[in-house]
C-alpha cells in the first residue's frame, strides 16, 4: 500500500518525538560536569551495520534494555529522566515505526560503542529519515 500524506505525517511526527527523546537523553548525560559520565562510558552498545530504513530500528529496540540500565545511573534530584518511562515511550514509538508485520534480523557492526556514540548514531538516523519525509 502506497504511503498517504497522513501516514507520512504521522511517521514524521513519531520520528520527531523519537529524536527529541534521544536528544534529551544525550543532553542529560553528555555534560562534562556529570559525575557519572566516565563510568557510564565504560558500558558498551551494539551499533547497526546499516541504518537507513525504518526496519533498521530493530537494532535500536534490541539495545533499549541496556540503555535503560545505564540511564538508571543518570538520575538526580533535579534531573528526572525516569528511565523506565522514557525507554517505554521510545519502545512504543520504535514498534510503531518499524512495524511488526515483517521480522527483520538486525546486523551489528563488529565494533561496540559508548552510550554517547550510540545515541548520536540514532539521532543522526532519525534526522536523516525525517529529512527524506519533508
Amino acid at each position: 500500500m502506497a504511503p498517504t500524506s497522513s501516514s507520512t505525517k504521522k511517521t514524521q511526527l513519531q520520528l520527531e518525538h523519537l529524536l527529541l527523546d534521544l536528544q534529551m537523553i544525550l543532553n542529560g548525560i553528555n555534560n562534562y560536569k556529570n559525575p557519572k559520565l566516565t563510568r557510564m562510558l565504560t558500558f558498551k552498545f551494539y551499533m547497526p551495520k546499516k541504518a537507513t530504513e525504518l526496519k533498521h530500528l530493530q537494532c535500536l529496540e534490541e539495545e533499549l534494555k541496556p540503555l535503560e540500565e545505564v540511564l538508571n545511573l543518570a538520575q538526580s534530584k533535579n534531573f528526572h529522566l525516569r528511565p523506565r518511562d522514557l525507554i517505554s515511550n521510545i519502545n512504543v514509538i520504535v514498534l510503531e515505526l518499524k512495524g511488526s508485520e515483517t521480522t527483520f534480523m538486525c546486523e551489528y557492526a563488529d565494533e561496540t560503542a559508548t552510550i554517547v556514540e550510540f545515541l548520536n548514531r540514532w539521532i543522526t538516523f532519525s534526522q536523516s529519515i525525517i529529512s527524506t519525509l519533508t
Epitope: K33, P35, L41, T42, F43, E69, N72, Q75, S76, N78
Partner: antibody
Framework: EVQLVQSGAEVKKPGESLKISCKGS????????IEWVRQMPGKGLEWMGV????????YYNEKFKGQVTISADKSISTAYLQWSSLKASDTAMYYC??????????????WGQGTTVTVSS | AIRLTQSPSSFSASTGDRVTITCKAS??????????MNWYQQKPGKAPKLLIY???NLESGVPSRFSGSGSGTDFTLTISSLQSEDFATYYC?????????FGGGTKVEIK
C-alpha cells in the same frame, strides 16, 4: 552474602611482573563496576581506576595510566590489577571495591580485604 | 583534582563523647542538587567500611549514632556517643569528579 575476596600477599623484586585478583560472589558480578584503590604504608587512600566487568570498559586515574592494567573475566567473576614492571614505590595495600551509582549516589559499598604488595630487592 | 582537607587529623576521645569530624573540599562536590560526599571507617589492618553516602544517608547496618551533614564544600561526620568499637580512622571521599579523591583521614584514639 555479597563479598569481594582478593588474592594473597605478594613479595616481588623490582622489574618483575604481577597480577592480583578480586573475586566477587553473592551478586551479579557483571552488573557492577569494580574499582581499585591504593593505600601506601601509613598513608591515605588513592583511587586508581575502574572496570566494567560486563563490557571490559575501563577508565584510569591519570596518575596510574600506563603504570597498571585493569582487566576482568566475567565468566569467573574476577577482576585483576597488573603490573608489567614493578617498582619499589608500588609497595602498598591494594583494595578492590564495588561501585554503586544508581539514583543520585556514587560510592563503594563492598570492599575486598586488600592485597599487600611488597617490592624490594 | 578536588582536594579534601579533614580536620582534625587525629584526636583523643573517651567513650560516650560526641565527636565531630569535618571535611572541606577545594571546590563544590554538589551536582544538580545532590552532594557526592561519602564517609568511610577504617580499622588497622582492615578494609574501609562505608558509613555515610551522599552526605547524609546512613548505610544499611551502620549504627544510628553516626550521621552526616553538609553540602557544597563543607561536610561533617558526627558520632553522637562514641563506643569502643568506633576508635578508628575516618575518611571522607568525593565522587563528584574524576579522579575520586579521599581526605587525609582523621584518627580517633582512646583518651
Amino acid at each position: 552474602e555479597v563479598q569481594l575476596v582478593q588474592s594473597g600477599a605478594e613479595v616481588k623484586k623490582p622489574g618483575e611482573s604481577l597480577k592480583i585478583s578480586c573475586k566477587g560472589s553473592g551478586y551479579a558480578f557483571s552488573n557492577y563496576l569494580i574499582e581499585w584503590v591504593r593505600q601506601m604504608p601509613g598513608k591515605g587512600l588513592e583511587w586508581m581506576g575502574v572496570i566494567n566487568p560486563g563490557s571490559g570498559g575501563t577508565y584510569y586515574n591519570e596518575k596510574f595510566k600506563g603504570q597498571v592494567t585493569i582487566s576482568a573475566d566475567k565468566s569467573i567473576s574476577t577482576a585483576y590489577l597488573q603490573w608489567s614492571s614493578l617498582k619499589a614505590s608500588d609497595t602498598a595495600m591494594y583494595y578492590c571495591a564495588r561501585w554503586r551509582g544508581e539514583g543520585y549516589y556514587a560510592y563503594y559499598d563492598v570492599w575486598g580485604q586488600g592485597t599487600t604488595v611488597t617490592v624490594s630487592s | 583534582a578536588i582536594r579534601l582537607t579533614q580536620s582534625p587529623s587525629s584526636f583523643s576521645a573517651s567513650t560516650g563523647d560526641r565527636v565531630t569530624i569535618t571535611c572541606k573540599a577545594s571546590q563544590s562536590v554538589d551536582y544538580q542538587g545532590d552532594s557526592y560526599m561519602n564517609w568511610y571507617q577504617q580499622k588497622p589492618g582492615k578494609a574501609p567500611k562505608l558509613l555515610i553516602y551522599a552526605a547524609s544517608n546512613l548505610e544499611s547496618g551502620v549504627p544510628s549514632r553516626f550521621s552526616g551533614s553538609g553540602s557544597g564544600t563543607d561536610f561533617t561526620l558526627t558520632i553522637s556517643s562514641l563506643q569502643s568499637e568506633d576508635f578508628a580512622t575516618y575518611y571522607c571521599q568525593q565522587s563528584n569528579e574524576d579522579p575520586y579523591t579521599f581526605g587525609g583521614g582523621t584518627k580517633v584514639e582512646i583518651k
